[in-house]
């Protein structure tokens, strides 16, 4: 081809090419074009002859201003029409009088301002007809009843103002999945405007001026539809009443969208009418006072987003929106439950009384103060079974003893992002008999015992990075009652003494990460008593990171036992020379990363065994000795590997000796060099 | 199952050491710590101190630091507790024992070795 | 070292009478507290650990209670067989000390 289309799999990619013609030289049996972001001012039928297999013609983003209706008589199995982002204007009956396969009708923004009379009459078989976009004033889109099969009609970012029965009745036979009105200025609902459209599932005003009174209107209106999904999102909506919604009592309504409305006072029973309702957003109001009613009727809700629902209006404590105790008790079906990014003053005795089925529920970032967590801080939880808490980010200082007591199948808690400086006694996790993930990390300072986790020995996953802790070094270890954990993070803790049993009977091990800390006596062979064999037994070990241990000696039999190991992280330590065979049993290694030592020589004798099954290898910034006993064998290696080795050609150099310096490892010629085959 | 089995009777004289040997089968015997602790004919129990069979690192109650020697033997999976300088009152059935998934318990424990110290 | 004084010492209740014992530790051992009953010529037997979580096979009517220092262990209706000698231990730190026991007698 002539042109620098691609062409895959039958689909060409002639996008952004600068094109004034379509290109007359692509394989006949394509059923993919995209000819989008070019200068294309025309579709002449003529060039698409060839082209007789088209199922979908993208020309989106050219400057096409009209359609010759033959277009679509060369292309007769056509079934997407993207033609976004033109000129075009003016759509007439013969427009896409042939396109009578068309599934997909993308014309947004586009100048069309006006549909006379019918031009999509034609498509029987159109499920999707974008006019978003437009200067569309109104919904009309024809003068007789058509689209049947139609299920998405993309109407936003027009200038419709009114919706009218005798416009909206060309769908008395169409089942609309969505109609997307958002963006629209429109002042007025005309009695039975829902009513000409055979079925309706989804409508989606967002970015529409309702307020308050319009929405109890549009409700009126929905009255005895098909309606399913609301979205109102940022339709001011700043109050809410028991009369609001009524009209949706006589409907089925399962999602129902209300986020970014600045909604301030949600009054009692504004939902009551709302009883099948399944999926509601709240996020990003301003409630200020949730009453014991507020929710009330909701009994069929299971998913419920308030994130950013809640927020003060001044630094005044006076001014924190409250929450009644027993409001949510209505909501008996609520399983997702998300309160994130608030300003709740704290957690009152029956906060959550009444969420009999709830599994998961996050407030990260909730509470004003929320310090400590004591034995009766989510008591109203008792009777909820659930699975996910995130308590991240609350400035949370303390865990008393029995905090968790409650949350008998609690099986993942997230702690991370907190304040948390105490010694853990384990009686803070009491009652956690199903837990399985207990996260930790950031948080000030968290001393361990013997026994701080004896009472959580479900236990899989322990997150403790960058928590200063303490006492890691006591023996027996306090991860010993921990023997189902597969995943250990004590990274970032500047941990400079551990014992050799600080990880014993950790048998199930598969992920530890122990990066940034200060490990690197314990490996010297100087050490008192010897190098400190912390890895020994852990035979399903993965994945190991010890980056950034300050390590300049590796104990030969330190990975002895990882015969599963598959990715170790050595990278950013001061590692010069490593002993024969360190790596002999790690036949399973993919991934190696020694970048930022101080590596000089890379012998087969030491990373042979190493480099067997390597997929990926990093060993970039190290001061490499250009030398035959040092590099060749490497060198002949990489020239020859499959394994991936990224920056290979700028950040392998040579440091010495001095006439190398700063040459590339991989171009070390080594055909002088005896004896140094990287495979025999 | 888990079984603690531990070395017959002894009897021995005031001055004299005594060895219990406790040997573990049912489960990786270097994974547990095994405890000692003691019970004099008619009183409580005592506890007299832990051993990693993994690495031998022991902690003694220091009330029997001074005379008490804990070892093990991986080989044949076999914990040991030596009592030295007896005395008439260290005359007591020594029991070996193990915590279980729950490391705040012992479970398991052996069938207990009387010693008697008596002149 | 945290002591552990256990009351009564020796006691006598008629079958099927409730009885209570009790243990208090001088120091806060939080939960870490475990009951055995040991027959005469046996090896202690593991009832309640963690201060309230029976051990498998004891049966019901033995239960446990407390947290911190003051710890109860209740059989609810004594039977023939729970004549025993009856030890609580603390697990919070060494030395892990036994109470001095309680000596169950049927009247």
């Known amino acids: 081809s002539t042109t620098k289309c691609t062409v895959s799999h039958e689909v060409a990619d002639c996008s952004h090419l600068k094109l004034t013609q379509v290109p007359d030289d692509l394989p006949t049996n394509i059923t993919v074009l995209n000819l989008t972001h070019n200068q294309l001012r025309r579709l002449p039928a003529a060039n698409f002859t060839r082209y007789s297999q088209l199922t979908s013609l993208d020309v989106g983003f050219n400057t096409i201003s009209k359609l010759e209706p033959e277009l679509c008589q060369k292309l007769p199995m056509l079934k997407v029409l993207n033609l976004q982002h033109n000129e075009l204007s003016q759509l007439s009956d013969k427009t896409f009088a042939f396109c009578t396969n068309l599934t997909e009708l993308h014309l947004m923004s586009n100048s069309i301002q006006k549909i006379k009379n019918n031009p999509f009459v034609k498509q029987k078989n159109l499920i999707t007809l974008d006019l978003s976009h437009n200067g569309l004033s109104s919904t009309k889109l024809g003068t007789q009843v058509q689209l049947e099969n139609l299920q998405e009609l993309l109407l936003s970012n027009n200038k419709i103002q009114a919706l009218k029965s005798e416009e909206l009745d060309i769908f008395a036979n169409s089942s609309l999945k969505k109609l997307e009105l958002s963006s629209n200025q429109i002042k007025e609902f005309s009695p039975g405007c829902f009513h000409a459209i055979g079925r309706l599932f989804g409508l989606f005003l967002n970015n529409v001026q309702l307020g308050p009174s319009l929405t109890e209107k549009l409700c009126l209106e929905l009255a005895n539809t098909s309606i399913r999904n609301l979205s109102l999102s940022n339709s001011q909506l700043s109050t809410t009443s028991n009369t609001t919604f009524l009209g949706l009592k006589w409907t089925n309504l399962t999602m129902l969208d209300l986020s970014y409305n600045n909604l301030n006072v949600v009054g009692n029973d504004s939902f009551a009418w709302l009883p099948q309702l399944e999926y509601f957003f709240l996020e990003y109001n301003n409630i200020q006072h949730l009453f014991s009613h507020s929710l009330h009727g909701l009994f069929n809700v299971r998913y419920l987003n308030l994130k950013r629902s809640f927020t003060k209006q001044s630094i005044s404590l006076a001014s924190l929106p409250k929450i009644d105790d027993f409001s949510f008790q209505w909501l008996k079906c609520l399983e997702h439950l998300n309160m994130e990014d608030n300003d709740i003053p704290g957690i009152k005795s029956n906060m959550f009384t009444g969420l009999i089925n709830l599994k998961y529920l996050s407030l990260s970032n909730s509470f004003t103060s929320l310090r400590t967590l004591t034995n009766e801080t989510f008591v109203s939880l008792a009777h909820s079974p659930l699975h996910i808490l995130n308590l991240t980010k609350n400035k949370i200082s303390k865990i008393e003893s029995d905090a968790f007591s409650w949350l008998g199948h609690l099986e993942v808690l997230d702690l991370g992002l907190n304040e948390i400086g105490q010694e853990l006694t384990g009686q803070e996790w009491r009652g956690l008999e199903n837990i399985f993930e207990i996260y930790l990390s950031y948080n000030k300072y968290l001393q361990l015992t013997r026994n701080s986790f004896a009472l959580v020995p479900s236990l899989q996953r322990l997150m403790l990075r960058r928590v200063a802790l303490k006492n890691v070094d006591s023996s027996p270890s306090p991860f010993q009652p921990l023997r189902n954990l597969t995943i250990l993070d004590l990274s970032n803790n500047n941990i400079a003494n551990i014992n050799d049993d600080m990880l014993e009977g950790l048998e199930k091990l598969e992920i530890l990460d122990l990066q940034h800390n200060n490990l690197a006596r314990l490996w010297k062979h100087a050490n008192p008593g010897g190098p400190i064999y912390f890895l020994k037994g852990l035979s399903h070990l993965h994945i190991l990171n010890l980056e950034s241990n300050g390590f300049d000696e590796i104990p030969v039999e330190v990975f002895k036992d990882l015969f599963e190991l598959k990715i170790i992280d050595l990278g950013l330590n001061n590692l010069n020379t490593l002993p024969a065979s360190v790596f002999n049993n790690q036949v399973s290694l993919k991934s190696l990363n020694l970048q930022k030592n101080l590596i000089t020589s890379v012998e087969k004798k030491v990373f042979g065994p190493a480099f067997r099954n390597l997929t990926e290898l990093d060993m970039r910034f190290n001061p490499f000795d250009c030398t035959c006993e040092s590099i060749a064998w490497f060198v002949n290696w990489i020239n020859e590997t499959h394994t991936n080795i990224p920056e290979l050609s700028s950040h392998y150099l040579c440091n010495t000796p001095p006439h190398y310096h700063g040459f590339p490892v991989r171009l070390f010629d080594t055909s002088s060099c005896k004896d140094s085959a990287p495979f025999e | 199952q888990v079984q603690l089995v531990q070395s017959g009777a002894e009897v021995k004289k005031p001055g004299a050491s005594v060895k219990v040997s406790c040997k573990a089968s049912?489960?990786?015997?270097?994974?547990?710590?095994i405890h000692w602790v003691r019970q004099a004919p008619g009183q409580g129990l005592e506890w007299m101190g832990e051993?990693?069979?993994?690495?031998?690192?022991?902690n003694y109650n220091e009330k029997f630091k001074t005379r008490v020697t804990m070892t093990r033997d991986t080989s044949i999976s076999t914990a040991y507790m030596e009592l030295s300088r007896l005395r008439s009152d260290d005359t007591a059935v020594y029991y070996c024992?193990?915590?279980?998934?729950?490391?705040?318990?012992?479970?398991?424990w052996g069938q207990g070795t009387l010693v008697t110290v008596s002149s | 070292d945290i002591q552990m004084t256990q009351s009564p010492s020796s006691l006598s209740a008629s079958v099927g009478d409730r009885v209570t014992i009790t243990c208090r530790a001088s120091g806060n051992i939080h939960n870490y507290l475990a009951w055995y009953q040991q027959k005469p010529g046996k090896v202690p037997k593991l009832l309640i650990y963690?201060?309230?979580t029976l051990a498998d096979g004891v049966p019901s009517r033995f239960s446990g209670s407390g947290s911190g220092t003051d710890f109860t262990l209740t059989i609810s209706s004594l039977q023939p067989e729970d004549v025993a000698t009856y030890y609580c231990?603390?697990?919070?730190?060494?030395?892990?000390?036994f109470g001095g026991g309680t000596k169950v007698e049927i009247k």
């Open positions: 231990q603390h697990f919070w730190s060494t030395p892990f000390t």
């Open positions: 049912g489960y990786t015997f270097t994974t547990y710590w």
């Open positions: 051993i990693n069979p993994n690495n031998g690192r022991i």
């Open positions: 024992a193990r915590v279980g998934v729950m490391i705040t318990t012992f479970p398991y």
């Open positions: 963690n201060a309230k």
